[in-house]
């Protein structure tokens, strides 16, 4: 008789999840010499231990502490790029500008990027059928708690000038409910971070509006200023040209506004 299984509203665990995490860990530690000491089997065991046999709506940051400890990594604190609703361009940027880092350029972010996972209470099984949706089911699910935990730690580590890439095509360019708006903004440390510089990425080719004047950007400026951090904002009118100029800064066309 098949056992009754909780049906959640979100997609189930990504297929071949354990193999994917392990493979990503091995690949990452091979590419990054400073992480060669990491034992990927231990990393997987700690990852698994965070959610296996636990109710997928009752996960806490403490559950992930063993994994956080194993994945401790020092990135240059003044080279951090945050992003909101514009992941692909942020990652394209750090692939070119190799001395800057998004969360997904760190081991823990790289391991979990684009994956879904959850377990079941009192069984050692991974649930490949469905996992809790943040809105429809619960916020304390394995994926959401993971990203909240690593995002908080990433923001806490930042110093000097921190950059954030924001999607100018969205109705809310800055969204208080995004991970950036709800976690990272509030965990930047004013004793270390002097400035948050927002890069607002324009979508339309003919869009010449100053999106730094958008009400949601003004809201971000207000939140940041009250946290005793200076705020600055730049429009990136042509993201294609922006990336090209990062690759080839000597190009004569790169002196004009991007």
């Amino acid at each position: 008789v098949p056992r009754w299984r909780q049906q959640w509203s979100g997609p189930g665990t990504t297929k071949r999840f354990p193999e994917t995490v392990l493979a990503r860990c091995v690949k990452y530690t091979e590419i990054h010499p400073e992480m060669r000491h990491v034992d990927c089997q231990s990393v997987w065991d700690a990852f698994k231990g965070a959610f296996i046999s636990k109710h997928p709506c009752n996960i806490t940051e403490e559950d992930y502490q063993p994994l956080m400890k194993l994945g401790t990594q020092t990135v240059p604190c003044n080279k951090i790029l945050l992003w909101s609703r514009i992941k692909d361009l942020a990652h394209q940027f750090t692939q070119v500008q190799r001395d800057m880092f998004t969360l997904e350029d760190t081991l823990l972010g790289y391991l979990a990027d684009d994956l879904t996972w959850c377990g079941e209470f009192n069984t050692s099984k991974i649930n490949y059928q469905s996992c809790p949706d943040w809105r429809k089911d619960c916020s304390n699910n394995p994926v959401s708690v993971f990203w909240k935990t690593v995002s908080r730690r990433f923001a806490e580590a930042a110093c000097d000038v921190v950059h954030v890439m924001l999607n100018g095509s969205r109705s809310k360019i800055f969204d208080k409910n995004s991970t950036f708006g709800s976690v990272e903004v509030h965990n930047l440390q004013p004793e270390k971070v002097q400035t948050l510089e927002a890069w607002v990425i324009h979508g339309g080719r003919e869009d010449s509006r100053d999106l730094c004047q958008d009400p949601t950007i003004k809201e971000l400026e207000s939140i940041i200023s009250k946290r005793n951090i200076q705020f600055s904002c730049k429009n990136i009118y042509r993201p294609d040209k922006f990336l090209q100029c990062v690759k080839n800064p000597e190009d004569s066309s790169c002196t004009s506004e991007i």
Epitope: H186, P190, E191, Q194, I224, S225, K226, R227, N228, I229, Q230, F231
Partner: antibody, heavy 117, light 107 residues
């Protein structure tokens, strides 16, 4: 109108204690970092303590740690500074100041603390 | 700690003069410098933020310039009500330190 009004200053003997208050109005007090800044008789300005907006974390210069305690009551829009084991060098005008983006945009009128026997 | 040095300590001027007050940081502080004015028996008030950004309500005769470790507060045409002490504030390292002040007096 944004207002900060300090009180609680006075004459106190060395080794004594004093509690300063700063009543605020005209803004959302809980949104802001708040500072105590003092001005010595020689007119030098120095920060004494500050408290963050969200988590209420507190910070002090190393020279004052353990003697001064800053706190806030967001429900009553009031900032406090508890000073103990006072020394003659603590004699100063004490200002409550609102901090935004690393500068002080609003100051109170100050309250005088004199430590003398 | 970053030390802020202001000069001169006292400046005697005639109304209508253009004056410059200097503030020097012991190391580069980028543009993290603010200026305050304190009149006799008053509390300090913000005059200029981030080296040169104006503050609403502050007369346009006040302006700021500089970068790195050398900064200047200029008063285009001094008026009698400008007498007082002017302080610079380093906000590069948070929390910050103040300069010793420059006293502006009218001859």
């Amino acid at each position: 109108e944004v207002k900060l009004v300090e009180s609680g200053g006075g004459l106190v003997q060395p080794g004594g204690s004093l509690k300063l208050s700063c009543a605020t109005s005209g803004f959302t007090f809980s949104d802001y970092y708040m500072f105590w800044v003092r001005q010595t008789p020689e007119k030098r300005l120095e920060w004494v303590a500050y408290i963050s907006n969200g988590d209420g974390n507190t910070y002090y210069p190393d020279t004052l740690k353990g003697r001064f305690t800053i706190s806030r009551d967001n429900a009553n829009n009031t900032l406090y500074l508890q000073m103990s084991r006072l020394k003659s060098e603590d004699t100063a005008m004490y200002y409550c100041a609102r901090s935004i983006s690393r500068y002080f945009d609003v100051w109170g009128a100050g309250t005088t603390v004199t430590v003398s026997s | 700690d970053i030390v802020m040095t202001q000069s001169p300590a006292t400046l005697s001027v005639t109304p209508g003069d253009r004056v410059s007050l200097s503030c020097r940081a012991s190391q580069s502080i980028s543009d993290f410098l603010h200026w305050y004015q304190q009149k006799s028996h008053e509390s300090p008030r913000l005059l200029i933020k981030y080296v040169s950004q104006s503050i609403s309500g502050i007369p346009s005769r006040f302006s700021g310039s500089g970068s790195g470790s050398d900064f200047t507060l200029s008063i285009n045409s001094v008026e009698p009500e400008d007498v007082g002490v002017y302080y610079c504030q380093n906000a590069h390292s948070f929390p910050s330190t103040f300069g010793g002040g420059t006293k502006l007096e009218i001859k």
